[in-house]
Interface confidence: low
């Protein structure tokens, strides 16, 4: 059960896993969520005790029953991890803490203009986990404007004290804001000789890299493959660091692979979610439960649905036995990784998928596309919504796309002249308009945000956000699409689809079933030659065939132009305008979403 509420003046009794220091209950909850074992926590605020050494302690807890007895405790704040929640979770923590000194290893001291610059310096320093900045009002003159960069083994402070006129905060590397070099190469037959800060078992080098990426102290790693000569060291993932931040020595070692943490990469990468299956592989760990299920996928689902399960091994039965069901061993460990990995025993192993929501949920795979045909099927475009207007009579108005659990992206021209968001309804998980009846669940719209430079579709800025009144739970039928990457990957979209319930041709009517059309992107220059009377800007993009035929039309407006890259769907365009529908040499014109990513983030994070 997902509990987001925090309980003030309340403590949870027992179940302690570990204690760390945290500047706030919200940060403590974030740490609990990312900790492999923590299900609940108690945070001791600065009013919680006569003893200042207990202030700002964050006690991470676990319980077989997923809850613990609550007791009255002055100044304590308790709550549950977000592991139990369906919504997306980010490790990014931007808050600044005034009059708090977060203690750690002060390894660098520099002068900065303000706390924001200090935070930026921390984000762009490979070792920095958090910082404390002495403001210009700080009592000691020689320390004013001094920015102390700090690190600890755990990435969290070793103590937190109240100190007037200082500001503390965390590195924003987890917000993908670092400018440090991002090295994605995996180096075969290579071992890095630097000191190990930790070692865990991993089934392959990519899981090892993901573990390194979200381990606070790991900067690079060496993975000893299953062919490694020394049996006891096979599948060992050695997490490493060095004073310089990069490997000092590399050794040529067969059957070892090495690489770097992706913590400084400027795009969202799946670092928590290990979705692969490992055949003929057994994961050892503390056994949580054994259940009979049909197939390894069902076993993974079982593990994902069991909140304490971290990984599993499925042992298939011969087809003739037990109705084809096998044994599903649900397991856990202190660090979330198997205690040992064995090969050649016939098991199929993998990890819980509940950590996938800590990565961007939009990156998870969806049902395979049905090739050919113009009608879509259920779950094919789970981000597509139908936006209805209820006055004077209820009808489909425009399309839109889910980009967050409370946010829909659509076209500005759909919303111009609406007197109130109250007459809008968002229906998600819908394939046929006929599914929309009086009692069909919908999301009300709390707020309409139209780009303030919008005048008319043909001039650009045809983009708007709808904030939903309530947050959406993601399912296979309704979930977000990724915004296009502003990060550091080459993106040339080869497969793009436009979807909607719009007309099939001018003068037609709204379609019942969601239609889809595969359309190629057209260069701006090419598009400009087709629309001589309009200025096709870099904030627009065009798609369609020279011979016409497949195109968006009336009623599709605001809907997505979805393009697939590296198995992930991106919202590349918003259906905006065009000359006719599917006319020869008249491609559809779309809002170029990548040019508005900053605007989208600014609006969705500010409200």
């Amino acid at each position: 059960e997902c509990v987001t509420k925090l309980f003030t003046d309340t403590g949870f009794q027992g179940g302690d896993v570990t204690t760390i220091f945290s500047p706030s209950a919200k940060h403590c909850q974030l740490i609990c969520t990312h900790h492999p074992r923590c299900l609940l926590f108690t945070f001791m605020a600065d009013s919680s005790s006569e003893d200042p050494t207990r202030w700002f302690t964050c006690i991470l807890k676990d319980s077989v029953t997923e809850t613990l007895p609550r007791v009255n405790m002055t100044g304590a704040i308790s709550g549950y991890s977000f592991k139990q929640c369906p919504h997306q979770i980010s490790a990014c923590h931007r808050n600044l803490y005034v009059d708090l000194d977060m203690k750690g290893m002060n390894y660098n001291s520099l002068m900065t203009r303000d706390a924001q610059e200090c935070q930026e310096r921390c984000t762009n320093d490979v070792h920095c986990h958090f910082f404390t900045y002495a403001t210009r009002q700080f009592p000691s003159t020689e320390h004013r404007n001094i920015c102390l960069l700090k690190y600890t083994h755990m990435g969290t402070p070793t103590r937190i004290m109240k100190l007037t006129k200082v500001v503390s905060g965390f590195s924003l590397k987890s917000c993908a804001l670092s400018k440090l070099a991002c090295i994605r190469d995996i180096f075969p037959s290579t071992a890095f000789a630097d000191s190990n800060i930790d070692s865990v078992m991993a089934p392959d080098v990519f899981v090892c890299r993901r573990i390194c990426t979200h381990h606070p102290g790991c900067l690079f790693f060496t993975f000893l493959s299953q062919e490694w000569p020394k049996e006891s060291e096979r599948n060992l993932c050695l997490l490493k660091t060095s004073e310089s931040g990069l490997p000092s020595t590399r050794i040529k070692k067969d059957r070892a692979l090495s690489g770097f943490s992706l913590q400084t990469c400027r795009h969202s990468v799946p670092v928590f979610c290990h979705s692969s299956f490992y055949h003929d592989t057994d994961f050892l760990g503390e056994e949580l439960d054994i259940v009979d299920v049909k197939g390894h996928e069902a076993c993974q689902k079982m593990c994902t649905d069991s909140i304490r399960c971290q990984f599993f091994t499925y042992s298939p039965s011969p087809e003739s036995c037990n109705g084809g069901k096998g044994k599903c061993y649900l397991k856990l460990s202190s660090n979330g990784s198997p205690t040992k990995i064995l090969h050649g025993r016939g098991g199929i192993s993998g990890y819980t998928l509940r950590l996938c929501k800590m990565d961007n949920v939009c990156t998870t795979k969806i049902k395979p596309r049905i090739v050919g045909g113009e009608a879509s099927v259920h779950g094919e475009w789970p981000w597509q919504i139908t936006l209805h207007i209820t006055s004077p009579a209820q009808r489909h108005l425009c399309g839109g796309s889910i980009i967050g659990n409370q946010w829909i992206l659509t076209a500005a021209h759909c919303l111009i002249g609406l007197e109130s968001p109250k007459i809008l309804r968002v229906y998600s998980g819908i394939l046929n308009q006929s599914e929309v009846k009086k009692d069909t669940a919908f999301f009300g719209v709390q707020e309409i945000i139209i780009h303030d430079q919008y005048e008319m579709a043909e001039s650009g800025y045809d983009i708007a956000l709808l904030k939903l009144e309530t947050a959406m739970n993601y399912t296979d039928a309704q979930r977000p699409i990724c915004l296009p990457s502003k990060g550091d990957r080459s993106v040339i979209y080869a497969e793009c689809w436009v979807t909607g319930w719009g007309y099939r041709k001018l003068g037609d009517k709204i379609q019942n079933t969601l239609q889809k059309a595969n359309v190629p992107l057209v260069t701006t220059e090419e598009c400009q030659t087709r629309y001589r009377g309009h200025k096709i800007t870099n904030k627009m993009l065009c798609a369609g065939y020279q011979e016409g035929g497949k195109d968006a039309c009336k009623g599709d407006s605001g809907g997505p132009l979805s393009c697939k890259h590296n198995d992930v769907w991106h919202l590349v365009g918003i259906t905006s305008w065009g000359e006719g529908c599917g006319q020869r040499e008249r491609p559809g014109v779309y809002t170029n979403v990548v040019e508005y990513v900053d605007w989208i983030l600014e609006k969705t994070q500010a409200v």
Epitope: L180, A181, L246, S248, P484, S485, I492, V597
Partner: antibody, heavy 116, light 107 residues
Amino acid sequence: QVQLEESGPGLVAPSQSLSITCTVSGFSLTGYGIYWVRQPPGKGLEWLGMIWGDGRTDYNSALKSRLSISKDNSKSQVFLKMNSLQTDDTARYYCARDYYGSKDYWGQGTTLTVSS
Amino acid sequence: DIVMTQSHKFMSTSVGDRVSITCKASQDVSTAVAWYQQKPGQSPKLLIYLTSYRNTGVPDRFTGSGSGTDFTFTISSVQAEDLAVYYCQQHYKTPYSFGGGTKLERL
């Protein structure tokens, strides 16, 4: 395949401004940083600045006040603008793709002469 | 900004010789140093990155070493086609910066 090509005015008078375009193909500008380097005749390489895939910029401190780098992702073009040119800005100007690991690509460069 | 200094502007060598070019950084750049080769009329070509990693297709006579502030680029057996200018560059932190270059010429 990956290609970068610089185009510039060739000759500019002192105190005037410079605008050089780097047109890329084979990859998307939303995905990679592009940096600018110049080389005066018979001299070494000087790193001028760069624009990241997400549009943020970094500049050589000594030239920051005169430099501006921008881009148009849809046209696959990056622009270097430099004002108050002097004769010692005479150089060959290169654009290069920022590499991650071992991938590195440079344009052939465009020659700029600052002279009255 | 980080300043990269190559102490030798010129170095003389013969075919078959072993030659080492040094580069010093004004502050710790970890091992994020690259080495470029430039021949007359050509764009620079990346040989080594992250101090010791050879770029694809670069012969193994070219090696790099060092960390922190002191770096060395070595050609174990100079070939005629190696006569060129060599530059070090720090790619630890923007703004990236180059050394002044070392011209390798025939003795």
